[in-house]
């Protein structure tokens, strides 16, 4: 296919940075100030993308390549290359449609993005919790309860030093 | 205004050699392929040898090992030395510009107006 399209397409070996110039007879030229092509054999050149109110430069914008943006502190990106910023939060909030709201009781948002998230069920994997959550932590699961049964202790002592011969008491 | 004027053709001797010049202006230089083409009397025009902007080359069969094309960006200038020079070598050489930088199958975008070489004893 590539050396079909190389003998039919007379533009195939321009290359990136170029467009294949039909107002001058199919010979190459450089993109224009603020465009660029990334691939060869382009017949014309993208006009670079411009990071402006909320957004900012990330990477300036170069004959071929398109300029980055990335947000301004206060925001973070989401979308497919940093199509949109969206205001952060504090950790312990979610984002609404009317703006940052506290976790409620029993969730919790480690993150300045996203939301807020249940805190772990302990007890379904029979453990019981050893440090309770927050709006910023989840919990956190300790033993099971039967492992801290009365004499019993989470913290398994080292062996006594036993003479040869000796078997367990 | 793309203009491409070849120099440097002249008479010579059998075995003698030969360097042809062409001048280049109006476009981006070294981003564009060129190439040189001849013209014998009563013959067709034909290739004789390409240059991609990369500097890879390539020449017609009749002329490989002894036709050295090659070009200086700076200048915007490309060259065809000449060597080995035969009677069948006798033509008018022009310098072309390549379309879309192509050098497999290059079909030509501008011509220049074609320097005379004339090898004969």
């Known amino acids: 296919f590539e050396r079909t399209r190389s003998l039919q397409d007379p533009c195939s070996n321009c290359p990136a940075g170029t467009f294949c110039d039909n107002n001058r007879n199919q010979i190459c030229s450089p993109c224009p100030p603020n465009s660029f092509s990334s691939a060869g054999g382009q017949r014309t050149c993208d006009i670079c993308r411009q990071c402006k109110g909320v957004f900012r430069t990330r990477k300036e914008c170069s004959s071929t390549s398109n300029a980055e943006c990335d947000c301004t502190p206060g925001f973070h990106c989401l979308g497919a290359g940093c199509s949109m910023c969206e205001q952060d939060c504090k950790q312990g909030q979610e984002l609404t449609k009317k703006g940052c709201k506290d976790c409620c009781f029993g969730t919790f948002n480690d993150q300045k993005r996203g939301i807020c998230r249940p805190w772990t069920n302990c007890s379904l994997d029979g453990k019981s919790v050893l440090v309770n959550g927050t709006k910023e932590r989840d919990v956190v699961c300790g033993p099971s309860p039967a492992d801290l049964s009365p004499g019993a202790s989470s913290v398994t002592p080292p062996a006594p030093a036993r003479e040869p011969g000796h078997s367990p008491q | 205004e793309v203009q491409l004027l070849e120099s440097g053709g002249g008479e010579v001797q059998p075995g003698g050699s030969l360097r042809l010049s062409c001048a280049a202006s109006g476009f981006s230089f070294s981003i564009n392929a060129m190439g040189w083409y001849r013209q014998a009397p009563g013959k067709r025009r034909e290739f004789v040898a390409a240059i991609y902007s990369g500097r890879n080359t390539v020449y017609a069969e009749s002329v490989k090992g002894r036709f050295t094309i090659s070009r200086d960006n700076a200048k915007n200038t490309v060259y065809l030395q000449m060597s080995s020079l035969r009677a069948e070598d006798t033509a008018v050489y022009y310098c072309?510009?390549?379309?879309?930088?192509?050098?497999?199958?290059?079909?030509?975008?501008?011509w220049g107006q074609g320097t005379l070489v004339t090898v004969k004893p």
């Open positions: 072309g510009l390549l379309k879309g930088n192509r050098v497999v199958s290059p079909s030509v975008a501008y």
